[in-house]
Structures are given as C-alpha cells and as structure tokens.
Amino acid sequence: YDFTNCDFEKIKAAYLSTISKDLITYMSGTKSTEFNNTVSCSNRPHCLTEIQSLTFNPTAGCASLAKEMFAMKTKAALAIWCPGYSETQINATQAMKKRRKRKVTTNKCLEQVSQLQGLWRRFNRPLLKQQ
C-alpha cells in the first residue's frame, strides 16, 4: 500500500491522543533504554509503511501484536485516514489468521514494540534530518 495520500496530521493526532498511551501500557515495566532502535524511516509515508509492517506482520519470536489494543487503533486510524487502505488488507489478514498463535508477551515482542515507538516518534517529526 502507498501511504502517500494519508491524512498525516489526523493520524498524528490519533497517535498522540491514544495510540501512544497504549504502546506505553504494553511496554510498562520495561526500561526505555532496554532496546536499541534498529528500524528507521525517512519520511511519513515510509514511517507508516514500517509501522504497518511491524504492527501487523508476524515475525520470528513475535506473532501476536496484531491483536493488541494499539494495533486495533492503528488499523482504525490507517483505514479511516488512508484512502483505500482497508481494501488492501484483506489478503494480509486472511494469511495472518492462519498463522495466529496464542497471545504471549515475549521479549521479542517488547523489542518490536520499542521499535514501533521509535517509528511513531519519527513519524511525528517529519522535518528532522535522518540520523
């Protein structure tokens, strides 16, 4: 999906209002310095591409993020403010349903959510030069 035509300011507002709080809740009890940010993004469409991938695509050691509260709200925000987004997700969701595992918060998931927090922070500061 090409995130170029999304309403970035509304997605940012939704993130600041509630999605960010849900990410913090998920990470509660984890030190903010525990994980190094290894995933980066260069502009807002790129950031949303990476956020979409880390939130909804199962990875080795972390198959369960798509059912978390922050993921549900992320999906809602992208569907509402990115034209045509919800239609592109049908095949991805069917595939994910087949692979879905029991919900377990592993260290790998905590690391992945830490990366997500970094991507969202970068999304919110689009004018910053890439590190």
């Epitope: 509630t18 809602a76 509402i80």
Partner: antibody
Framework: QVQLQQSGAELVRPGSSVKISCKSS????????MNWVKQRPGQGLEWIGQ????????TYNGNFKGKTTLTADKSSNTAYMQLSSLTSEDSAVYFC???????????????WGQGTSVTVSS | EIVLTQSPTLMAASPGEKVTITCSVS???????LHWYQQKSETSPKPWIF???NLASGVPVRFSGSGSGTSYSLTISNMEAEDAATYYC?????????FGAGTKLELK
C-alpha cells in the same frame, strides 16, 4: 449523517439460532470497527466483540466465544451477529456500535444502533 | 479483565444540586481510554464524555469529567430534569472492553 439501523425484534425457541443485522449508512463502512453490546433487562452493558468489515478481522470477549459469530457484508454495508444454542440467558437487547476517533481523537463507540430485542422462550 | 466499579448504583438529586458519580478501575489505565455514556430507558446509549474529560457534541457544559489512573468521576454542576438517566463508564485500554455496572440518576 451516520446511521446504524438494526433488524426487528425476535422471538425464538431455546436451542435455536438467530441472526441479527445492523445496516450502516453515511460513512465508509469498511474502515470502521463495528462492536456488539448486550444488555439484559434492567441490567448493564456487556461487550460481545467487534469486527473490521474491511477484512473480516474479529475480536471476541471470551465469555461469548462459541455463542456468537460476527460477520460483515461490504456490498450491503451490513454487519451481522449470529447467536447459537439459545437459552433464556440470551434474552436481551443487542446493540451494534461503530467505534471511531472523535473530534478530540479519543477512540470510543461514537454511533449506536437502536437495539434489537431477542426473547428466548418456549 | 479490567473491572470498573461505579458508585453509587442509584441516586436521586434535586434540580440545581451538584452530582458526582465515581468509577473505580481495577488496574491503572490512561485517562484517554476512559469514556462515559448516558442511557435513558428504552433507548440506545449515547457517548457523553470522551477521554475522561472531553464532552461529546451537544452535551451541556454543566457536565464535566476528571480523574486518572484508577479513579475517575463524572460531575453535574447543577442537576436538571433532563439529566435523569443511567450513566456508564467504559474502558478502552485492554480486551475485553468493559463497562461499569451503571449509576441510575433520578430526579428528586
């Protein structure tokens, strides 16, 4: 304007099934999660689950797994909830409720259907 | 699951009286995830207060909400007849979504 129109009251036999509908208009149906909420007579509200019509993704309250099945038909902008193996405990009013970001970007159930009464009786 | 405990369950207030309804949450949640709904008999619930303190469209300014962590409240500064209803708090912090049992507010 956003409207959620639910199907009419149902009187059903114990052990049978019932499917109630919630027809949406005035917004992009595929892009918003749809919730279902149960209210027994004189009681409070109980969340059953939700469906994302765009891809059929669902999340259920564990108390209702096996009892309810949520589906959505994008061609008619309609969400459905099927209740199976009905008992007197299932007699209630069932509401559909869209969830979205309000003007302050808080996420909540912002529009509700008028409710469908289901009475289970022999 | 997160349990929301409302108090009182039932109360009556005279016109002009100040009313406070509380919602105690079993584990701490972000204030952005606590909402209030109003329901009058035989009708569907209406969104009333979003994110602890933000009034929904059309809600009179005599209503206010406050709180954080595990303790939240809805206040009516001057009770009016049209405020007689049942009020529910609800959390959107974790699954399953849960509601308080409701506070029925009657006109004295």
């Amino acid at each position: 304007q956003v409207q959620l129109q639910q199907s009419g009251a149902e009187l059903v036999r114990p052990g049978s099934s019932v499917k109630i509908s919630c027809k949406s208009s005035g917004y992009a149906f595929s892009s918003y999660w749809m919730n279902w909420v149960k209210q027994r007579p004189g009681q409070g509200l109980e969340w059953i689950g939700q469906i994302f019509p765009g891809d059929g993704d669902t999340t259920y309250n564990g108390n209702f797994k096996g009892k309810t099945t949520l589906t959505a038909d994008k061609s008619s902008n309609t969400a459905y909830m099927q209740l199976s193996s009905l008992t007197s405990e299932d007699s209630a009013v069932y509401f559909c409720a869209r969830s979205g970001f309000d003007y302050g970007y808080f996420y909540a159930m912002d529009y509700w259907g008028q409710g469908t009464s289901v009475t289970v009786s022999s | 699951e997160i349990v929301l405990t409302q108090s009182p369950t039932l109360m009556a207030a005279s016109p002009g009286e100040k009313v406070t309804i509380t919602c105690s949450v079993s584990s701490s949640i972000s204030s952005s995830n606590l909402h209030w709904y109003q329901q009058k008999s035989e009708t569907s619930p209406k969104p009333w207060i979003f994110g602890t303190s933000n009034l929904a469209s059309g809600v009179p300014v005599r209503f206010s909400g406050s709180g954080s962590g595990t303790s939240y409240s809805l206040t009516i500064s001057n009770m009016e007849a049209e405020d007689a209803a049942t009020y529910y708090c609800q959390q959107w912090s974790s699954y399953p979504l849960t509601f308080g049992a409701g506070t029925k507010l009657e006109l004295k």
